[in-house]
Amino acid sequence: TPLGPASSLPQSFLLKCLEQVRKIQGDGAALQEKLCATYKLCHPEELVLLGHSLGIPWAPLSSCPSQALQLAGCLSQLHSGLFLYQGLLQALEGISPELGPTLDTLQLDVADFATTIWQQMEELGMAPALQPTQGAMPAFASAFQRRAGGVLVASHLQSFLEVSYRVLRHLAQP
């Protein structure tokens, strides 16, 4: 059933989520900046075809439009999306020594955000009985593919977070 911004999500949860989204956006931007500065990989739109061939997936948020928001479905899609990005970021491991610490922090911040969402789902009795299982992740055959994959994953994640932020801000409005 559609639920608008007056739904029963605690304000403290929503504010925590907004904080976390902005933290991850900062991490993601730092990763993008380093990929651009170090490897001149600055334009994700130029790598879209490579992204298709590598099989880098997108995470949907179709249950989250503000006009017909389905709370359980939206939280579930948020969590599943974050779970997907944990796997994608894991696939980027070893991308380069310069990017390692930034990627490490991004990975943990995404995991912590997924935890916050799940915690709230549990409190509302909405958490699924089982965690989603990780689907097949892209295999990068070369250093270039891994770096290009990094650009695309960071770009996809930023788009996902922008939508997430809009949804959460909408829900946080009194």
Epitope: K23, T105, A111, D112, T115, Q119
Partner: antibody, heavy 119, light 112 residues
């Protein structure tokens, strides 16, 4: 309520390995990261790394990358830390602590496991 | 890695008197989201550490309000308005802005 119960004290010879366990209860184990922290005798706290049980991903402090291996068993809600090629400087109390964000980060700790390395 | 430096390392205090511990980070812990990723932990004798303050100034659940945290991006202070005997132990500041998480060396608070 949340409990983290660690395995008992260990005495090991130099060059040996040791595996410390941290059994979690009172929450959905795979959802939270589990971190490990070292405290050498009379010293401060050092972050070793963490395991994300939901995807089996472990991340390490560079300093401990060749020393510690973190794993987790979702079926028993237990996190493990294996320390290899033990030396006297590995003698310490090792803590597991539950991860999270904000007021959740390290809000719960195990009781600590003393690992003594002595010939 | 971000280096956390505490002072003093030892702090003798008379019960009922205030106490103050300083912590400095080698990099600003203030994120662009407005949050300062600085934590304080207390390790009482023979115990595991416990969370006191999160995100620089927020009191953790069950922590008495005689504790308070403040600071800027790189300089932080933990204050105890009136020290009690149960407050003895080692206080650690820590950052969780980025990995690896790092702790200060600790400040040992003891009763005079």
């Amino acid at each position: 309520q949340v409990h983290l119960v660690q395995s008992g004290a260990e005495v090991k010879k130099p060059g040996a390995s040791v595996k410390v366990s941290c059994k979690a209860s009172g929450y959905t184990f795979p959802i939270y990261t589990m971190h490990w922290i070292k405290q050498a005798p009379g010293q401060g706290l050092e972050w070793i790394g963490y395991i994300n049980p939901s995807i089996g991903y472990a991340n390490y402090n560079q300093k401990f990358r060749d020393k510690a291996t973190l794993t987790a068993d979702k079926s028993t809600s237990t996190a493990y830390m294996e320390l290899s090629s033990l030396r006297s400087e590995d003698t310490a109390v090792y803590y597991c602590a539950r991860g999270g964000y904000g007021d959740s980060l390290f809000a719960y700790w195990g009781q600590g496991t003393l690992v003594t390395v002595s010939s | 890695d971000i280096v956390m430096t505490q002072s003093p390392l030892s702090l003798p205090v008379t019960p009922g008197e205030p106490a103050s511990i300083s912590c400095r980070s080698s990099k600003s812990l203030l994120h662009s989201n407005g949050i300062t990723y600085l934590y304080w932990y207390l390790q009482k004798p023979g115990q595991s550490p416990q969370l006191l303050i999160y995100q620089m100034s927020n009191l953790a659940s069950g922590v008495p309000d005689r504790f308070s945290g403040s600071g800027s991006g790189t300089d932080f202070t933990l204050k105890i308005s009136r020290v009690e005997a149960e407050d003895v132990g080692v206080y650690y500041c820590a950052q969780n802005l980025e990995l690896p998480y790092t702790f200060g060396q600790g400040t040992k608070l003891e009763i005079k």
